[in-house]
Interface confidence: medium
């Protein structure tokens, strides 16, 4: 399997509950606007054929196009959430800079690119979606890079 | 075919001190997220403890916190539960369970037959 | 004790459609789609039924289904059949990385 390294972020990072809860509320807030519960962005299909140590840079890849092409682009929405949860986003993502996988990353951009695909075909509501499962963003973050 | 075994329960006082045990197999251990959950005799289950798949997140519930440590060996395929200063109501069978998919272990889709702690003076 | 509420029994004739509910609160049902719902016979390990708020393992029967509106979460078993009979939790993921359940409902089929 390809080795990743510097995929790692500190424990505190998700000890801090005043901004796990607005992350938390922010999902929700979105998710009450999202009204095509039958598509999953982070789920079983996003894992597919990924083992745990890769999962993190896998994370780190939708992290990023989530901060890219979804938050920055919708940012006047939902506040006050979006202004106090993005910035936290950007810093975990700053802090997985240098995390990268040594070998062969094509079965982990496949699955991310079909993310992404989901996300623009659906449009706004896929961005909306994108937002409405930030829980699942963080909690996969926690479980893959501690 | 996945299978997770449960052992190391038994009697013991009040005060006491055990160690669980899952032994896993049919999978891919260092996939999964891991819990242990109990279920007091006639009662309902409540989860103890969850470990996430390298044991860098630990969790547990506020009733067992500061005396149960959960662990885990990849390199054995196994699951620990330190329980310390047991009590009586710690009594029940314990059960290990693992996620559905390796994204989401509270998602506990296998469980073991569980092992039988009983607390009694 | 359990954090989530749930009727301790519903019972329906065979071929009739039951709903249990599974009450919480804004810190878990209310404000993750992280539900699940679980069957358990009399003597046997839990089965997970529903998982996500709605989303069914692969060998479940499509006769089981979940939702969610609020801080309530409802499992409906549509076809009642005899099988069914059984112990049904909810349970629910919260922020500060625990797992609640509810107290159980006793599905009795008549």
């Known amino acids: 399997a390809p080795i990743s390294s510097h995929c790692r972020l500190d424990k505190s990072n998700f000890q801090q509950p005043y901004i796990t809860n607005r992350t938390f509320m922010l999902a929700k807030e979105a998710s009450l606007a999202d009204n095509n519960t039958d598509v999953r962005l982070i789920g079983e299909k996003l894992f597919h054929g990924v083992s745990m140590s890769e999962r993190c840079y896998l994370m780190k890849q939708v992290l990023n196009f989530t901060l890219e092409e979804v938050l920055f682009p919708q940012s006047d929405r939902f506040q006050p959430y979006m202004q106090e949860v993005v910035p936290f986003l950007a810093r975990l993502s700053n802090r997985l800079s240098t995390c990268h996988i040594e070998g062969d990353d094509l079965h982990i951009q496949r699955n991310v690119q079909k993310l992404k695909d989901t996300v623009k075909k659906l449009g706004e509501s896929g961005e909306i979606k994108a937002i409405g499962e930030l829980d699942l963003l963080f909690m996969s973050l926690r479980n893959a890079c501690i | 075919e996945v299978q997770l075994v449960e052992s190391g329960g038994g009697v013991v006082r009040p005060g006491g001190s055990l160690r669980l045990s899952c032994a896993a197999s049919?999978?891919?251990?260092?996939?999964?997220?891991m819990n242990w959950v109990r279920q007091a005799p006639g009662k309902g289950l409540e989860w103890v403890s969850g470990?996430?798949?390298?044991?860098?997140?630990?969790d547990y519930a506020a009733s067992v916190k500061g005396r149960f440590t959960i662990s885990r060996d990849n390199a054995k395929n196994s699951l620990y539960l330190q329980m310390n200063s047991l009590r009586a109501e710690d009594t029940a069978l314990y059960y290990c369970?693992?996620?559905?998919?390796?994204?989401?272990?509270?998602?506990?889709?296998?469980w073991g037959r569980g092992t039988l702690v009983t607390v009694s003076s | 004790q359990a954090v989530l509420t749930q009727p301790s029994s519903v019972s329906g004739s065979p071929g009739q459609s039951i709903t249990i509910s599974c009450t919480g609160a804004?810190?878990?049902?209310?404000?993750?789609?992280?539900v699940s719902w679980y069957q358990q016979h009399p003597g046997k390990t839990p089965k997970l039924i529903i998982y996500?708020?709605?989303k069914r393992p692969s060998g479940v029967s499509n006769r089981f289904s979940g939702s969610k509106s609020s801080n309530t979460a409802s499992l409906t078993i549509s076809g009642l059949q005899a099988e069914d009979e059984s112990d049904y939790y909810c349970?629910?993921?919260?922020?500060?990385?625990?797992?609640?359940f509810g107290g159980g409902t006793k599905v009795t089929v008549l």
């Open positions: 369970a693992r996620g559905w998919y390796s994204g989401a272990a509270w998602n506990m889709g296998y």
């Open positions: 049919g999978f891919t251990f260092d996939d999964y997220g």
């Open positions: 470990v996430n798949w390298n044991g860098g997140t630990r």
């Open positions: 804004s810190g878990d049902v209310g404000a993750y789609n992280f």
């Open positions: 996500d708020v709605n």
């Open positions: 349970s629910s993921y919260t922020s500060t990385f625990s797992v609640v």
